[in-house]
Interface confidence: low
């Protein structure tokens, strides 16, 4: 019968001829009366056999990532008779892995959106690197992820590549962050290869800012000839939030005279002071009203940011008109 061990050849061997092993018949007594032959893909070009001894050699540099095993056939012939000594047999040469491939992030560019003020531990995104080396061969393809840039706001789970928030962030201070993740094979041991990727993390807005009046005191004038419904001026608050989180509603907090009203221009987010009833310079030529401003939409969990609406004082001077 045939006698051989499992055949392995390391990839990327630079020698012109590398002995892999021996293939022989147990009928071979070593007197050179048998001839060994190699057949199949790679026979003669990649692998050769010593016809007399059955020793097999690799004569080309191999790349496991291109081809990890070769299936060949062996024959042994009695030189005297020309007959097969053993039935033709199939055997396998496995290309063994070396760590010659760095981890690669295949899905980049990575981009994620996470709400500002998200608590620690909130999942942002998972990044995954691939390593073309053999995952079953030692640690060549065993990866560890680490954060090169993004502390203290982000952390990465070393074995999964899951990025999480590690510190609360305020969109109003910074609305996006670039995080750089490194993947290292050989679980970080010497000889490890690495690859990096960038992740753009954008913070989406939450309503964590209340509107605040630009001025603590506004001064407006109204002619005593102005009809009711006249817009006599505008007041404005600012809100550091964006979009619907910055939409606001103005209202009168205090107007003992009940002479004025405030409506909200939802396009400009301004408060428009409206004359509700006619004024008379001779009766009163100066009014003070207090206005307040609140956000339009405030989720229950964010009410803590919206206690005590911002207020402003509006001094309104009535302009005299000569009466006939």
């Amino acid at each position: 019968g045939w006698v051989w061990n499992q055949f392995f050849v390391p990839e990327e061997m630079n020698t012109t001829s590398h002995h892999i092993g021996q293939l022989r018949s147990d009928l071979d007594n070593g007197n050179n009366s048998f001839q060994y032959k190699l057949l199949g893909a790679g026979a003669g070009s990649t692998f050769i056999i010593d016809e007399r001894t059955g020793d097999i050699y690799a004569i080309q540099k191999l790349d496991r990532e291109e081809r990890s095993l070769y299936i060949l056939r062996a024959q042994v012939i009695d030189i005297a008779t020309g007959r097969a000594v053993e039935p033709e047999s199939e055997f396998v040469i496995k290309v063994s892995d070396i760590n010659d491939n760095e981890p690669k992030f295949l899905d980049e560019p990575y981009e994620a959106i996470v709400p500002e003020m998200s608590p620690e531990g909130t999942l942002v995104i998972q990044v995954t690197a691939s390593d073309a080396d053999d995952p079953s061969s030692g640690n060549n393809a065993r990866l560890l992820y680490s954060l090169l840039q993004g502390q203290p706001y982000f952390s990465v789970e070393p074995t999964t590549g899951v990025i999480r928030i590690s510190s609360k962030m305020d969109r109003e201070l910074q609305d996006e962050y670039w995080v750089i993740i490194q993947a290292k094979d050989m679980i970080g041991q010497p000889g490890a290869l690495s690859g990096t990727t960038s992740v753009l993390i954008k913070l989406s807005d939450v309503n964590d800012n209340k509107p605040i009046f630009k001025e603590s005191l506004y001064r407006l004038t109204v002619s005593e000839s102005a009809p009711t419904g006249t817009s006599i001026g505008t007041i404005m608050a600012y809100d550091n939030d964006i979009g619907e989180n910055a939409e606001m509603d103005y209202s009168i907090e205090e107007d003992d005279s009940q002479t004025f009203d405030i409506i909200t221009n939802h396009e400009t987010q301004e408060g428009i002071v409206i004359l509700k009833k006619k004024v008379d310079f001779e009766h009163q030529n100066h009014y003070g009203i207090r206005a307040k401003v609140k956000n339009h939409h405030v989720p229950e969990q964010l009410m803590k940011y919206h206690t005590e609406a911002s207020t402003t004082f509006i001094k309104i001077q009535v302009e005299d008109v000569d009466e006939p």
Epitope: R219, T221, N285, H286, T312, F313
Partner: antibody, heavy 119, light 107 residues
């Protein structure tokens, strides 16, 4: 008649604090916005701060923002100016002034109190 | 802020003469929110004119104010001895600022 009397001025070292008072009489103090205005020696007038009639709103000149605090005690008919982190350039006569009820000009002024910031 | 520039810096006149003081604003003073004060040596300022042209209570009619937008004038028709003082304009259209003053002195 309307009277405004300032007090609390004096010589103070840079970085120190001082509180000025202005006692008001002869009018309904709680109905008027009140101001502090200063005048450096030989110089012009500089508006410093205003407080609304009810004390809920204050407004400051940029030169004193964050260092000075205007306040009022309606029960005592008194206006105050708390001056912290004083600098040499704060040296001046400090006047309290009443804002006209129907306007925003200053119709009554106190006689002033001198604050001298010097080491 | 609105900057007020007064001219001239000093006005040398005799009693009985007419004094014309100018105040120019760096931007339009809305609704003629401009006042004039005078200050005698060692005294507090005193309101003369508010709203650019309205005389304050107790102010003699020799004092008159005019102007709008960026140019304002205080006129003293006949100078009395007590009128020799420093005059300040003040805008209250946007916060409060004063001009640097015009000194009216006896010639």
């Amino acid at each position: 008649q309307v009277q405004l009397v300032e007090s609390g001025g004096g010589v103070v070292q840079p970085g120190r604090s001082l509180r000025l008072s202005c006692a008001a009489s002869g009018f309904t103090f709680s109905s008027y916005d009140m101001h502090w205005v200063r005048q450096a020696p030989g110089k012009g007038l500089e508006w410093v701060a205003v407080i609304s009639y009810d004390g809920t709103n204050e407004y400051y000149a940029d030169s004193v923002k964050g260092r000075f605090t205007i306040s009022r005690d309606t029960s005592k008919n008194t206006l105050y100016l708390q001056m912290n982190s004083l600098r040499a350039e704060d040296t001046a006569v400090y006047y309290c002034a009443r804002e006209r009820y129907f306007d925003w000009s200053f119709d009554y002024w106190g006689q002033g109190t001198l604050v001298s910031v010097s080491s | 802020e609105i900057v007020l520039t007064q001219s001239p810096g000093t006005l040398s006149l005799s009693p009985g003469e007419r004094a014309t003081l100018s105040c120019r604003a760096s931007q339009s003073v809305s609704n003629t929110y401009l006042a004039w004060y005078h200050q005698r040596p060692g005294q507090a300022p005193r309101l003369l004119i508010y709203g650019a042209s309205s005389r304050a209570a107790g102010i003699p009619d020799r004092f008159s104010g005019s102007g709008s937008g960026t140019d304002f004038t205080l006129t003293i028709s006949r100078l009395e001895p007590e009128d020799f003082a420093v005059y300040y304009c003040q805008q209250y259209s946007n916060s409060w600022t004063f001009g640097q003053g015009t000194k009216v002195e006896i010639k």
